[in-house]
Every structure is written in C-alpha cells, then in structure tokens.
C-alpha cells in the first residue's frame, strides 16, 4: 500500500498525503497525480521543480507545511490551485512562469511584508487570490493588472494604510473583495471605478472621515446592498448586507456612508458622484463632469453601449479612472485618423492657466445613435473600437500645458457607426443623451479677442442654442480659494429657446447639500444673452486666481446637432473647479459627479 | 471487437484468498484504466477497485487493505487479488473498462460468480 | 460516500408510451471546472452485463438508440425513454463518476405490463 491515499474525483487522481511527518516529496507518488496534498508536513523549503514529471497535477495543497521558501524552478503545465496557507513564507517568488495555469493561489496566513511587482505577471488565468493574514503594508502599483479574470480577492487582517488608486482597474469580473481588518483611512478616489462588486467587506479599518472620504461615502451609499460584515464560517450569501459595518474611526464609529461632510465643497472634488440625492433617477444615463487646472493629461476610456440590463444605475455606468502620464511643451488637439475622416492637428502654445470642463454623457438604451456627418465616410457596421481623442490644454502659470484626452471605444461587431467627429443626434424630442463629449476652455485675457459667451456650433455656419443655466456655487466663510460648483440644467419638455444664464449662489453653511435646487439661495444674477453683457469673468474672478473667458468649443472636437429639439437637451450637470494648490484635500485633479 | 473475459471465481470459505483475472482484447489496454465491479445476487451494482493506466490502484473502504488490483500490460490482463473474504463478498464480479481518465465504464465483461461460504 | 437514490424501483411500461426514471445524489455532480455533471445511466439487461447508455449526464454512447434521453443537473436527474420498446425491459441503473467511491443507484427495474 502507499504511504498516502488515493481517491479519484472528477477523472482526476487524488493522492492525499497530509500530515504524514513528510519533510520531503512521497518516493511512491503515483505519476498520474492529479490532485496532491502535502499539508500538515514538516517540509520547510519547497520547489516545483519537484514536480515537473507530475504532468496531470492540477490541484497542489502545501499548507501547515513550515515553509520559509518557495523556488518556482520547475513548470507544472496544468496547475490550476495552489494551497501555501498557514506557512512562514516572507516573500513570493515571481509565479507566472511556473504556473501559467493557474486559476487560484492561496497565500494567506503567511508572513509576506510586501510584494513585488511583478509577482503575478504572466498569471493570466487566476481567478481567486487570497492574501488575508499577513503582513502586508503597502501593495505595488500595478500588482493585478496581469490577473484580468480576477474573481476574488481577499486582503483582509493586513496592515495596509493605503491602497494603489487603480489596484482593480481592468478587473471586469470581480464579484467579492475582502479588505477588512486593515489600517485603512481612505478609498481612492475613483478607487472602484465602474465596477459592480457583489460582495465587499470593509469593517474594522481606520477610516477617517474628512472631506476626502466623499467618494467612499458615496460609493458606501450606491453600494448598500453589496457590503457585507464578514463572519467566520458564515456563507456571505447567508448573510444580509450591512453598510453600517463600515464606521469612522474618527467620529465615534459613525457610519461612513452617513457622514455628513459639513464644511466640505459640495459636489467635492473627492468624489466620483454628485451629491444630488433627492433627483429622481435617470437610470439611462450618467454624466460626468471634470473641471481641472492640474497639469496632468487625463485619460477616461468610455464603452458605448446599445443596450444595458434596468439594473442599479451602477451597473450601467461606463468609464474608468484617470490614467496620468507626463506632458510635453506643446498642446496638441488631435483626433486620432480612422477610415474616412481626418486627423486634425492644432497647436497651441501659451501660458496662463486653463480651466477645463469635459461634460461626457454615455448613452445606454439604443433609440439615439451616433452618425458621421454627410461628408464623412460610414464605417463598416462591424467596426472595430476606434479612438476619438479631444484634447484640451490646461497649463498652469509658468508649467507645461496639458492635454485632456477623451477615449471612445465601441464593441467589436457593433452597428453603431462612431466618427471621429461625435455628431449628437435625436431622433425625436428626447431626454436621453448621447454619448459626447462637449469642451469648454477658459484662458487668460489675452491680446486675441473672444467670445464671452460658449456656443456649440455645427459644421456649417448655423446657430445652435446652448444650454440654459448655469449655476455657480460656493460655501460661505471660505477663506481661500474655494472650489466653485455649477449646475447647467434644461428645463423639461421646453420647445422654446432658453437663453443662458450664470448664477452666483452660496448655501446655507448648515445645509447638508443634497439637492443644489432646493437649498442653494441666489446672491447675483447675470443674464448673458447677447455678446454685449456683462463678460462672465467678473463674476468669477472673485473666486478665481485667475480669470476666465469662456471659449466656444473647437468645432472639430465637438459638433452637437439637434433634431426636431428647439434646444439643445442635456441632463443636468454638476460641476467643480478647483485650484492649482497641492495641499487643499479637495482638489483631486479628477473627480467627477455624476449625476442621473 | 473489445472484449473482456474474467475469470477465477468460484467458492471459498471466510478467511481465504481468490485471484480473478481479465483478459482483455480488442483495445489498447494499457492506454485505459480498468475496474472491478461486483453484484451480489439479486442486488445493485458495487464498485470493488480501479486502477489508472499508469498502474495506480484505489479502493473503497470496503475492501482496502483486503483486496489488491494490479495489471500487466504486456498479457493485456487485469488481476484481482481478494485475501480475507467475508460472505459479504460473494457475488458476480464484472471486469470493466473505463473511457479515458473517465471514471464511466464503457464495456463490460461477462462476470464471474464468487461465493465466499463455509 | 455520494449516495445515489433511484425511483421507483419498479417500472411498469406499455411499449410505445413513454417512461421516466428519477436519480437523486446526496450531493451535486457538478464540476464547476468544465460545468458538467458526472452521471452515467446503465442498463442491465436479464441475465447480461451492465451497457453504458448515457454519460456525463446527456451524452448518449454510441450504438444507443436516440429514444433513450438524459437530463438534469447538481443532484436531480432523469432518464427518459421517448417510447419504451421490447428490448428495453431490464434494471436500469445511474452512477456517479464525479468522485470515488463510484457509487450507483439501487436500480429501477422496467419491465412491460
């Protein structure tokens, strides 16, 4: 007979040798080893290497076995899950070479301090990666971008403070994410992005409630139903959800979803949401705002969708944080060339502060399309995603300017034709919005005269009606520059032109702002309806280091035309500037909020 | 044609020892892992042991440690060594092929009758 | 030990018409790793050995006739016999190849009224 036991389960050999006083590998190991467990043995360093003949291993349990090392040295071809648990492991050897099979790798309950890089490179397969019970204080930039199928990942009962702001960009099918039990104070900023995370434990961090945490609130508060307090031996979907696990550690263990962010900028640049609650929802469409002066090109990559389940406004959210990258002297507007349109190169070089404002609106159900203009070429229904880029400069004084890049991508097989040049088209008077992009840039007074007043304008020369309100708010009793919100709104069922108008309001320093139109209180009005009234720059400057001129939008970055509307139909949309400061913890150069 | 022929039953009393064979044909028999199964008289079917192509026997708990399952492929047979046997253990005893690493059994012999009795 | 339970275990048929046998396993068969069910269905015929009808839940072995169908998943199965034929009549068996102990069915006898 031999030493360990031998089963078959699911055509594969099962050999279990566990807790045999093995300090090495069973001489007798059946060749056809398909699932072999080692654990409780007293191994202490182990190399793959060991089982490279082993070529039907798929399943290898190596817990409790004391280990201090592991060597990937050997290619096990077919191994699917790997069991290092409730070792002495300090450090993990780079697995992707080893094991490029493998789907689920448990690491938990070990001593691991850190992780390099690139430890999971060339793990394209894993699904399940469990990390709770060690050390961990910090994870590195990029540690999950190789593990694309990532399904669950457990961190919990670290010592992690703080995580990388895109840990799970690119992770579509993660369903469960275990961060309990660690130093934590804060999310990122766009931290989730648009995933929808069935199952997410939170409790018993360190989380700090301040104006930072708005966009972990507000995540918390889209997301109620999906945070869970873990137990021990509890089946998650055996248990009900609870939000309120998640408490501020700062504030008497109040729950985080229910901090009131008093004294916050509204709308706060740390959040990826609006804070207009009491709006019914628009589950059709999110838009989301970006008001910048950081000089930092920002990337958001859009999906455009023709239809999406009537599930959560989540789920149908598309867009992914930021990327930042370094900029060049030169600003250059370009649109990326596709079949049949052009590339359109514009080069501005300049140096006073730019603010920008990108308004992009994703369309999910599919009654409005987007469509070339006449002069275009139709792509081929199935196009493959094609990149339309925007690009906007928004330099600070004495720095280098900066781009703001706008990525619109279709699924492949699409019949959605994208030009390069986003037409907005309704077929009928709708309040469904279309995927675009609108641009506005603001500049120094320069020698150049321009505009005060921002038009959308067509390809050719015609006169298109610009949204009509705009809002600007700001808390009372600030001090310093504080960052300014704006909401642009279209009243419902309008068929008469709206002329523009530009609003200065302050709330009330006790309101919780939830609903701008209902607690704002208007200070200063001024109707901007021809060229000739008062330029808007002196309303701003008062808020403003700089002041603003608002720009007409490049017609080649944006042309919105409507049909069969007397005006042009946007959600409404709130908006933050900020300043240049590094310090303020508001000014994030890329929140956004969305609004319904 | 696969074919599979058993053999070496017949009566012995508690305590003793039988080898049943199976001379298989027809197919590759060493690609393919082979089993026993046994039925008592006018009862279901009972896995008895199986053993993969590359030689590795398992057991239920029934019979390990009693019974011992092995193959030469050169002689294209599969072997049953059955020591310490109880009346329980009476019954037709079917050599069986199995499909692959699969653990279904996609032929059949014919059977031999084991009556374990005093 | 996955325990395999049949029923009936008596089957009383009228050649032409359909028939229907139901095997339960105390726990699923389902490979989440490739999503099949690991159950085969036999039949005994009177004094012969056990045939493979039917594998991995639905697929018919070859040689069987397309009257014999299989269906079910996780711990609920079926066997059916569109119209039950003469040569049909024997104890039908299932078995679970999902993980050792292979374990079957006590049987379900068909036999024609």
């Known amino acids: 007979q031999h030493t360990c036991s031998i089963s078959k389960v699911t055509s594969l050999l099962e050999v279990n040798c566990e807790n045999k006083k093995l300090t090495a590998l069973p001489a007798d190991l059946p060749a056809d080893t398909g699932i072999l467990h080692l654990g409780e043995n007293q191994l202490g360093t182990f190399s793959t290497a060991s089982l490279v003949h082993f070529t039907h291993l798929t399943y290898l349990y190596l817990d409790r076995c004391e280990l201090t090392s592991l060597q990937t040295n050997g290619k096990l071809i077919k191994l699917e899950n790997l069991d290092l648990s409730h070792n002495n492991l300090k450090s993990l050897p780079s697995l992707g070479w080893a094991l490029p099979a493998l789907t689920t790798l448990d690491v938990s309950f070990n001593k691991l301090g850190s992780l390099s890089p690139g430890v999971l490179d060339g793990l394209s397969q894993l699904q399940e990666l469990y990390l709770q019970n060690n050390d961990l204080k910090s994870l590195p930039p990029g540690l999950l971008l190789p593990t694309t199928k990532l399904k669950k990942l457990n961190l919990a009962n670290n010592k992690l403070r703080e995580l990388p702001s895109g840990l799970l960009d690119g992770l579509e099918d993660l369903d469960t994410l275990y961060l309990q039990r660690n130093w934590l104070r804060t999310i990122p900023k766009g931290f989730f992005g648009t995933l929808l995370l069935p199952f997410v434990f939170l409790h018993a961090n360190s989380w700090y409630c301040d104006c930072e945490i708005l966009y972990f609130r507000h995540w918390l508060q889209e997301n109620a139903n999906n945070v869970y307090l873990w137990k021990q031996g509890v089946d998650v979907k055996d248990t009900t959800p609870n939000v309120a696990s998640v408490r501020c550690a700062n504030l008497d263990n109040a729950p985080v979803y229910s901090y009131p962010g008093k004294g916050c900028p509204t709308s706060s640049g740390d959040t990826d949401y609006d804070d207009y609650d009491d709006i019914p929802d628009v589950p059709a469409t999110r838009t989301e705002v970006k008001f910048s002066t950081n000089t930092k090109v920002h990337t958001t990559h859009w999906s455009l969708l023709a239809a999406a389940p009537s599930t959560s406004q989540d789920s149908q959210m598309i867009s992914l944080p930021p990327t930042h990258k370094p900029t060049k002297k030169q600003s250059t507007f370009i649109h990326t060339q596709s079949p049949g349109f052009t590339t359109l190169p514009e080069t501005m070089e300049s140096n006073p502060t730019f603010y920008s404002l990108k308004l992009n609106t994703v369309l999910i159900p599919s009654p409005t399309t987007l469509e070339p203009t006449s002069t275009q070429a139709t792509p081929e229904p199935n196009i493959q995603p094609m990149l339309t880029t925007s690009t906007l400069t928004t330099p600070e004084h004495s720095t280098t300017p900066v781009p703001t890049t706008t990525i619109l991508t279709t699924p492949e097989h699409s019949t959605i034709p994208v030009p390069t040049t986003a037409i907005l088209t309704t077929p009928k008077p709708s309040t469904i919005p279309v995927p675009t992009t609108a641009t506005l840039t603001t500049l120094e007074p320069s020698t150049t005269p321009v505009p005060t007043t921002a038009t959308l304008t067509t390809p050719e020369p015609s006169t298109t009606l610009v949204p009509t309100t705009a809002t600007l708010t700001t808390p009372e009793h600030s001090t310093t520059p504080v960052p300014t919100t704006a909401t642009l709104t279209t009243p419902e069922h309008s068929t008469t032109p709206v002329p523009t108008t530009a609003t200065l309001t302050t709330p009330e320093p006790s309101t919780t702002l939830t609903n701008l139109v209902s607690t704002i209180s208007p200070v200063l009005t001024t109707t901007l309806t021809t060229p000739e009234s008062t330029p808007i720059e002196t309303i701003l400057e008062q808020f403003f280091t700089t002041e603003l001129t608002l720009l007409p939008t490049l017609e080649s970055t944006t042309t919105i035309i409507p049909e069969q509307n007397s005006f042009l139909n946007l959600p409404e949309v709130a908006l933050v500037s900020s300043d240049t400061s590094e310090s303020s913890p508001f000014l994030n150069s890329d929140f956004c909020c969305f609004l319904p | 044609e696969v074919q599979l022929v058993e053999s070496g039953g017949g009566l012995v009393q508690p305590g003793g020892s039988l080898r049943l064979s199976c001379a298989a044909s027809g197919f590759t028999f060493s690609s393919f892992a082979m089993s026993w199964v046994r039925q008592a008289p006018g009862k279901g079917l009972e896995w008895v042991s199986s053993?993969?192509?590359?030689?590795?026997?398992y057991y239920p708990d029934s019979v390990l440690g009693r019974f011992t399952i092995s193959r030469d492929n050169s002689k294209n047979t599969l072997y049953l060594q059955m020591n310490s046997l109880r009346a329980e253990d009476t019954a037709v005893y079917y050599c069986?092929?199995?499909?692959?690493?699969?653990?279904?059994?996609?032929?059949w012999g014919q059977g031999t009758l084991v009556t374990v009795s005093s | 030990d996955i325990v395999m339970t049949q029923s009936p275990l008596s089957l009383p048929v009228t050649p032409g018409e359909p028939a229907s046998i139901s095997c339960k396993s105390s726990q699923s068969l389902l490979n989440s790793r490739n999503q099949k069910n690991y159950l085969a269905w036999y039949l005994q015929k009177p004094g012969q050995s056990p045939q493979l009808l039917i594998y991995f839940t639905s697929t018919r072995e070859s040689g069987v006739p397309d009257r014999f169908s299989g269906s079910g998943s996780g711990t609920d199965f079926t066997l059916k016999i569109s119209r039950v034929e003469a040569e049909d009549v024997g104890v039908y068996y299932c078995q679970q190849h999902y993980s050792s102990p292979w374990t079957f069915g006590q049987g379900t006898k068909v036999e024609i009224k």
């Open positions: 053993i993969t192509s590359a030689g590795t026997p």
């Open positions: 069986a092929k199995s499909r692959g690493y699969e653990d279904y059994f996609d032929y």
